[in-house]
Every structure is written in structure tokens, then in C-alpha cells.
Interface confidence: low
């Protein structure tokens, strides 16, 4: 190999050992029969050398550094050449370095031809191994602007006072052009400006200077985004840290097309703007840091550019001004991710502040829109608390547990609507009355409706789940002793069509001691399955529940239990069941921890089933499943 560097070229070539490998056989640079491991060639020198091994690329790397001085004379602007030509260099991993020094008043602009650059973060690498490392200078301090791969959006980087550009090419890469040019500009009065150009839909991840280390103190960095007018851009911060400021405040500023309040100033912790049409700028401004404990300012963010969706121009008004203690969250329902660009899915408040999830609270009217390619990627969860603090005021009061129409009209699916119903302890109880009689979900007769009501105790220490109930059954009402949560959970998009079937009224009633009372009015010829609360885990200790079962005059009810014994073993107290005819008050009492469960029995009149638990030994819980079937009295029951 022969390398000859012209005089006055300000180029230095250094061949040195690369990352040590575990290769057994060492390799040397052979020059004038001497074996060396490092060779430096300066301007005006001509050196002939060879290697002592067949694969020098496994051992050595080459660095070609060109110093460009714009301080003492004219600057060589224009397209930057690879000198010496790659064809004259040995096939080693090579790094071309251009170190440009200029006055503070001079702006320098790196212009990248297509393909543009894509910034990568710490630990990431470029697929083709070609990397561009760019740094600037503040006085004597070097500032890393970033490391970039090909195939991105970054088209220009403007700096002042100097720039160092390192282009790393793997030994096997055929590239023989630098791919960039240098131009002079007027002073930019900031650390740097990065221009990012979008031709169509896509995303770009960008980072503050020195990332993941701290952004230089009290500096300003700007990103200019060129976005076709027919597309929309949204900014989201992926990672940021704030330093400890002594003076001024760290912030980001946006110049947004059409905004009457430019620049728009945001804190880093704010939700960032979305749904922006056309070009915009984003600037990061540091502060004067506390000398004792500076902390670090750093920012990694993503700009997502996509077509405006049909929904993005529609404004939905969610009027929660008359609601109390209610929150509505619109959030992503996780979906399959593909490797190709996936448009973002955002919900926007007042069409500007967009994020992947949004919580609206009661007491206000909210205007929202969607920036999303497929609204089935979102769903809604709502929580509302209805509490009574004064039993004299609430007694006999009723509330409708109905999903407000404003919410039903939103174009995203409702997942859960939870009502937390709170009553004063030992003063009031609750009764739930459905618009349509309910069926209890059991595995013998599962619910197959588009929604169910999940009813559970809302007392933190109490582990009591009454069950899941859906319309189309025989349960006319459910009375509960104390605080509960009722969750309307939807299972299918068809809930929108079936929404009229929902409707539950809660009333505050005088306190009673039983944990729950179910009023059941079976329909002829249908089998009603009922099960004790906390199925699978056992009725809680010392808990009592009842079923008030109506039998019409011309019918007979058959009560059937689904196992021979209850299986409960009592540690203290007794577990018992009372079956009582309501007309005659005649009752049968069964000891659940001793007796076998009754055989199927026939009841001509309405009757009660009451089950009271003892304190069971662990593992011997009380779980009962039974059914009620009506048949006409005229049928011969023998």
C-alpha cells in the first residue's frame, strides 16, 4: 500500500490496532522490514507499507483527520471530498474526521444529501455500520450533538464556533463519497439547529446535545421540522430529566403555524402539542444551574407525522359539568405491533394537547378530538362515586346508574363504567333495581350479552364479590348491606346497540344486617341458576345472604342443590340454611357443616332461602350453587 498526502492538505492518517481480539496470531504493519503496530502519516509524507497477515481488517483501523481552519483565511465550503480516496486506502474499518474551527460569529451548516440522517441513542447501532458522529464546541468544551445513521429525516445541522464530523465506514463498505457539504451562515446565536424533513408519514426520535449526559448549562438548541401541509405532527417526550435551576427556568418553546401565541412555552413535564399542520420549530432552553448540585437537563423525544384521520377534524363535547366525583379515562387497549411504521393513536384536548391517554374529570365541559388511524385501538374506563354522608338526607333517595349519553356518543368503545356506592356505616344499606331483570353468570349458564354488571364490596378489608350479572334473567333486585362497587363491563362493540338494555337504579334504604338479599321472580319454563357470593373462594366468615324467591299462583317451584354436601367445615360457630315458606312461615333448618343438602324440593308458594356461614377452617369453604325451575301446577308432580 502507498499513501501520499499532499503538502498543505492538513490531513493526518493514523493506522492503529483496533479493538483487541482473541485471534491467536498477531499482525503487524511492515515498513522498511520493521514490524510496528501504529503508523502515523502527516501532510507532505509518502509512505509504502504492507501487513504481515492476510486479514488486517481484523486487527487494524484507520483514521483520516482533516483540519479545516476558518479562523485565519477563507473557508473551503461546498461538497466535502473523501481524501485520500477510499480506493487508495487499505481495506480497514475507517473513520474520516473533519475538524472545522471558526469564529463565534460564523455559522456553519452541514447539509446532508439523500438519504438523510436518523439519530440513534446510546447503545444503538446502525444496520449498515455507517455512522456519523457530530460534535460542536462551546469555547474549549466539546459538545456531542449526536450520532446518526442513514435513512432518516435530518437534512441539515447548523452550528457556530466549529464543528467536528466523524464518518465511520466499515472495511467492507463501498461508499466513496462523504454525503455532505459545508456552507457558511450568519451566526445562529445558539448551540445548534437541526432540520428534520418529512416527505410523508413517519417518525423521528431526537435527543438533546450530550444525551444521555446533561445538556450544556444555559444553552439553547432548536429543531426545525419541515412537514407537508396535508400531514399532521405530534410531539411526545420519551425521556427527560430536569436540572436544579438557580436562575431562569428550563422549558421548551414551539413556533407553531397559525398560532396567535408564538412562541408557545411548555414545561418539559407538560403534555406536548399534537395535531400540528405544516412546519414548526421546537427549542430547548436550559437554565443557570445550582453550582453545588447542578443535576442534568436531558431530553429524548419523538415526532410522529401522519395523515389527519377522519376523526381529527371532529370535535366531541363531553359535558361533565353536572357530574360529581367522576373521571373518564380514554386509553390505548394494547394491540399487535408491526415492524413497519404504525401511526400514532392520540386523543386531543381542545385539538392541541394530544397524548395516548387522557383523563377528564367532572365539573367541566371538555372538547376532545382524535388523531388516530383506528379508534378500536382505544377504549374508555369511567369511575363515578355516589356517596351519602347524611343518612337522614339520603334515605329512600334513588340514583340512576346509567352511562351518560355523551359518553355513549364518543367513537371509542366503553370498557368499564364503575360506580362506587358509599353509605354511612351501620346507618343505611343499598338496593339495586335493574331496568330489566338480571341473570347471574354461572358456568352452568354463562352470560352471553354484550355487557355485565360486576358487583363487589367496596370496603377495602372485605373480600366479597357478589357476582357478575347480565340482563335477561330473573333477579328483580339486589339488596346489599354496605359500600359496593358496580361495574358495567362491556364485552362486545354491540354494546352500543344494546345500550338501551342497561339501566340500574340504586336506592338508599334502612340498614339491614344481612350481607345481601336477592329478590328472584323466575319466568316459567326457564331454569334460574343462583350461587353464593365469592364463588370459588367461599362465602366470608359469619356472612349471611338470602334469596327471596317468588312463585306465581299457578306454578310450582323446584329448588335443586348441585352437590350432596356443602363441604364447609366450621372452626367456630355453625353454618346453616333456612328454607322458609313465606305464606305459612313454616321453615326447615339445615346444618350445612353436618347435614346433607336437601334433595330437590317443590314449593307452591313464595319462599326464602337464607344461608349463614360460620368461621370456616381454611380450605373448607362454603360455596353453594342451586337452581329454581317453575312448572305449571296442573302437571302431575308425582
Amino acid at each position: 500500500f502507498e499513501i501520499a498526502l499532499p503538502r498543505e492538505s492538513n490531513i493526518t492518517v493514523l493506522i492503529k490496532l483496533g479493538t483487541p481480539t482473541l485471534l491467536a496470531k498477531p499482525c503487524y504493519i511492515v515498513i522498511s522490514k520493521r514490524h510496528i503496530t501504529m503508523l502515523s502519516i502527516k501532510s507532505g509524507e509518502r509512505i509504502v507499507f504492507t501487513f504481515s497477515c492476510q486479514s488486517p481488517e481484523n486487527h487494524f483501523v484507520i483514521e483520516i483527520q482533516k483540519n479545516i481552519d476558518c479562523m485565519s483565511g477563507p473557508c473551503p465550503f461546498g461538497e466535502v471530498q473523501l481524501q485520500p480516496s477510499t480506493s487508495l486506502l487499505p481495506t480497514l474499518n475507517r473513520t474520516f474526521i473533519w475538524d472545522v474551527k471558526a469564529h463565534k460569529s460564523i455559522g456553519l451548516e452541514l447539509q446532508f444529501s439523500i438519504p438523510r440522517l436518523r439519530q440513534i441513542g446510546p447503545g444503538e447501532s446502525c444496520p449498515d455500520g455507517v455512522t456519523h458522529s457530530i460534535s460542536g464546541r462551546i469555547d474549549a468544551t466539546v459538545v456531542r450533538i449526536g450520532t446518526f445513521c442513514s435513512n432518516g429525516t435530518v437534512s441539515r445541522i447548523k452550528m457556530q464556533e466549529g464543528v467536528k464530523m466523524a464518518l465511520h465506514l466499515p472495511w467492507f463498505h463501498p461508499r466513496n463519497v462523504s454525503g455532505f457539504s459545508i456552507a457558511n451562515r450568519s451566526s445562529i446565536k445558539r448551540l445548534c439547529i437541526i432540520e428534520s424533513v418529512f416527505e410523508g408519514e413517519g417518525s423521528a426520535t431526537l435527543m438533546s446535545a450530550n444525551y444521555p449526559e446533561g445538556f450544556p448549562e444555559d444553552e439553547l438548541m432548536t429543531w426545525q421540522f419541515v412537514v407537508p401541509a396535508h400531514l399532521r405532527a405530534s410531539v411526545s417526550f420519551l425521556n427527560f430529566n430536569l436540572s436544579n435551576c438557580e436562575r431562569k427556568e428550563e422549558r421548551v418553546e414551539y413556533y407553531i403555524p397559525g398560532s396567535t401565541t408564538n412562541p408557545e412555552v411548555f414545561k418539559l413535564e407538560d403534555k406536548q402539542p399534537g395535531n400540528m399542520a405544516g412546519n414548526f420549530n421546537l427549542s430547548l432552553q436550559g437554565c443557570d444551574q445550582d453550582a453545588q448540585s447542578p443535576g442534568i437537563l436531558r431530553l429524548q423525544f419523538q415526532v410522529l407525522v401522519q395523515h389527519p384521520q377522519n376523526e381529527s377534524n371532529k370535535i366531541y363535547v363531553v359535558d361533565l359539568s353536572n357530574e360529581r366525583a367522576m373521571s373518564l379515562t380514554i386509553e390505548p387497549r394494547p394491540v399487535k405491533q408491526s415492524r413497519k411504521f404504525v401511526p400514532g393513536c392520540f386523543v386531543c384536548l381542545e385539538s392541541r394537547t394530544c397524548s395516548s391517554n387522557l383523563t377528564l374529570t367532572s365539573g367541566s365541559k371538555h372538547k376532545i378530538s382524535f388523531l388516530c388511524d383506528d379508534l378500536t385501538r382505544l377504549w374508555m374506563n369511567v369511575e363515578k362515586t355516589i356517596s351519602c354522608t347524611d343518612h337522614r338526607y339520603c334515605q329512600r333517595k334513588s340514583y340512576s346508574l346509567q352511562v351518560p349519553s355523551d359518553i355513549l356518543h364518543l367513537p371509542v368503545e366503553l370498557h368499564d363504567f364503575s360506580w362506587k356506592l358509599l353509605v354511612p356505616k351501620d346507618r343505611l344499606s343499598l338496593v339495586l333495581v335493574p331496568a330489566q331483570k338480571l341473570q347471574q353468570h354461572t358456568h352452568e349458564k354463562p352470560c352471553n350479552t354484550s355487557f355485565s354488571y360486576l358487583v363487589a364490596s367496596a370496603i377495602p378489608s372485605q373480600d366479597l364479590y357478589f357476582g357478575s350479572f347480565c340482563p335477561g334473567g330473573s333477579i328483580k333486585q339486589i339488596q346489599v348491606k354496605q359500600n359496593i362497587s358496580v361495574t358495567l363491563r362491556t364485552f362486545a362493540p354491540s354494546f352500543q346497540q344494546e345500550a338501551s338494555r342497561q339501566g340500574l337504579t340504586v336506592s338508599f334504604i334502612p340498614y339491614f344486617k344481612e350481607e345481601g338479599v336477592f329478590t328472584v321472580t323466575p319466568d316459567t319454563k326457564s331454569k334460574v341458576y343462583l350461587r353464593t357470593p365469592n364463588w370459588d373462594r367461599g362465602l366470608p366468615s359469619l356472612t349471611s345472604v338470602s334469596w327471596n324467591i317468588s312463585v306465581p299462583r299457578d306454578q310450582v317451584a323446584c329448588l335443586t342443590f348441585f352437590k350432596e354436601r356443602s363441604g364447609v367445615v366450621c372452626q367456630t360457630g355453625r353454618a346453616f340454611m333456612i328454607i322458609q315458606e313465606q305464606r305459612t312461615r313454616a321453615e326447615e333448618i339445615f346444618s350445612l357443616d353436618e347435614d346433607v343438602l336437601p334433595k330437590p324440593s317443590f314449593h307452591h308458594h313464595s319462599f326464602w332461602v337464607n344461608i349463614s356461614n360460620c368461621s370456616p377452617t381454611s380450605g373448607k369453604q362454603l360455596d353453594l350453587l342451586f337452581s329454581v325451575t317453575l312448572t305449571p301446577r296442573t302437571v302431575d308432580l308425582t
Epitope: 358456568h443 354463562p446 364463588w535
Partner: antibody, heavy 119, light 107 residues
């Protein structure tokens, strides 16, 4: 980070008892239920039951009622599975796993404990 | 009890191919179905919850679909580390059952 660490392998004779422990760390034991799953050699997974870590109340699948006892010691954040009157067909890997009380999905699992019953 | 039937019992594929695993429930279980992966000598790992909800840390090539009684786990492009046994699990009602498993093996 969340971890469930189980006790080591056991070799037992038929008729003996064994107690497998599962120590939870990286979260509060009482915030999640603890489930136990059995896997016989070369076979699939069988859900055995679960224990309510707030109340200590266990629940068993039908095939695991009687000789199997689930218990807790919240002071050391540990759940236990005890099997008495061991039989050769109890030879299996036993896993503890963390779950939700309703509609459980098991997001963290112990490394498994192999119990071998052989004369 | 809910019986879950997985098919096929064994699926032979080459890396880069698409894998489709099926799980059928003996009755409607809405979306109360979860998927797990178990590699030889390891504990199971939760892949998908509630039929289609992804789990943090699980590669995006895994996705689930279905509701009612028919469910599918899809691996869009099988990687070498995906060869394992996959189980579905019902959380609809007591007892919480698992399918018998589908073994995904290298062709």
C-alpha cells in the same frame, strides 16, 4: 424487581409429607393472590388452587382437595404448599405464581420445585 | 369445568414463518383467556392477557385474538428463541384450567 423464589428439589418416600415454600420479593405479598400450578413430568399445567394473601383463605381445585394445604406467613412474605400422604403420582414440578383475585392471569412465576416420590 | 382444547398438538415451522396457534373453549368464556410460553426446563411466561392484551416486555411479534370460545395466538415471524410449548388458560370460572399445550418445534 418482582421475584418468586421457591425452595429446592425434594426426594420423598410414599406416605411422607413435603412442604414447598415460595418467597415473594419486589412487591407487597398481600396486594396479589398466590396460585399454585402442578406440572407432572412431560405433561401440561394443572391449576391446583390459590390463597387469598389478605385473609389467608385458600381455595382448591377439586383434584387437590384433602391432602394439599396452602398457607402463608406474611411476616416473611412467604406462601407454602404442603402435601401429605405422598403418592408416586404426586411426582411433579410445583410452581407458585402471582395472580389477581378475579379473572387471574399469572404475571410472575417461581422457578418451580421438583418433588420426587419414590420408594 | 371449562375444557380448553389446543391445536395443533405440534407445529413445525422454520424461523421467519408465521405461527398460528388455536385454543377452543368448551363454552363461551368472553375474553377471559390468557396465553403462556414455556421453554424446556423453565417456568411459564405470560405472553397475552384477556385474549388480546399485550404484556410489557413481550416482543410485538406475539399477538392474540378471539372472544367467546375460539382464540388464536399468532407469532408474526418466528424467531429461533420462540420454539417452546404454548398454553392457553381460562380465567372465566372456577377451576382455572389450562389447555394441553401446543409444541412449536423447528422444521
Amino acid at each position: 424487581q418482582v421475584q418468586l423464589v421457591q425452595s429446592g428439589s425434594e426426594l420423598k418416600k410414599p406416605g411422607a409429607s413435603v412442604k414447598v415454600s415460595c418467597k415473594a420479593s419486589g412487591y407487597t405479598l398481600t396486594d396479589f393472590s398466590m396460585h399454585w400450578v402442578r406440572q407432572a413430568p412431560g405433561q401440561g399445567l394443572e391449576w391446583m388452587g390459590w390463597i387469598n394473601t389478605e385473609t389467608g383463605a385458600p381455595t382448591y381445585a377439586d383434584d387437590f382437595k384433602g391432602r394439599f394445604v396452602l398457607s402463608l406467613d406474611t411476616s416473611v412474605s412467604t406462601a407454602y404448599l404442603q402435601i401429605s400422604s405422598l403418592k408416586a403420582e404426586d411426582t411433579a414440578v410445583y410452581y407458585c405464581s402471582r395472580g389477581r383475585d378475579y379473572d387471574p392471569h399469572f404475571d410472575y412465576w417461581g422457578q418451580g420445585t421438583l418433588v420426587t416420590v419414590s420408594s | 369445568e371449562i375444557v380448553l382444547t389446543q391445536s395443533p398438538a405440534t407445529l413445525s415451522l422454520s424461523p421467519g414463518e408465521r405461527a398460528t396457534l388455536s385454543c377452543r373453549a368448551s363454552q363461551s368464556i368472553s375474553d377471559f383467556l390468557h396465553w403462556y410460553q414455556q421453554k424446556s426446563g423453565q417456568s411459564p411466561r405470560l405472553l397475552i392477557k384477556y385474549a388480546s392484551q399485550s404484556i410489557s416486555g413481550i416482543p410485538a411479534r406475539f399477538s392474540g385474538s378471539g372472544s367467546g370460545s375460539d382464540f388464536t395466538l399468532t407469532i408474526s415471524s418466528v424467531e429461533p428463541e420462540d420454539f417452546a410449548v404454548y398454553y392457553c388458560q381460562s380465567a372465566h370460572s372456577f377451576p382455572y384450567t389450562f389447555g394441553q399445550g401446543t409444541k412449536l418445534e423447528i422444521k
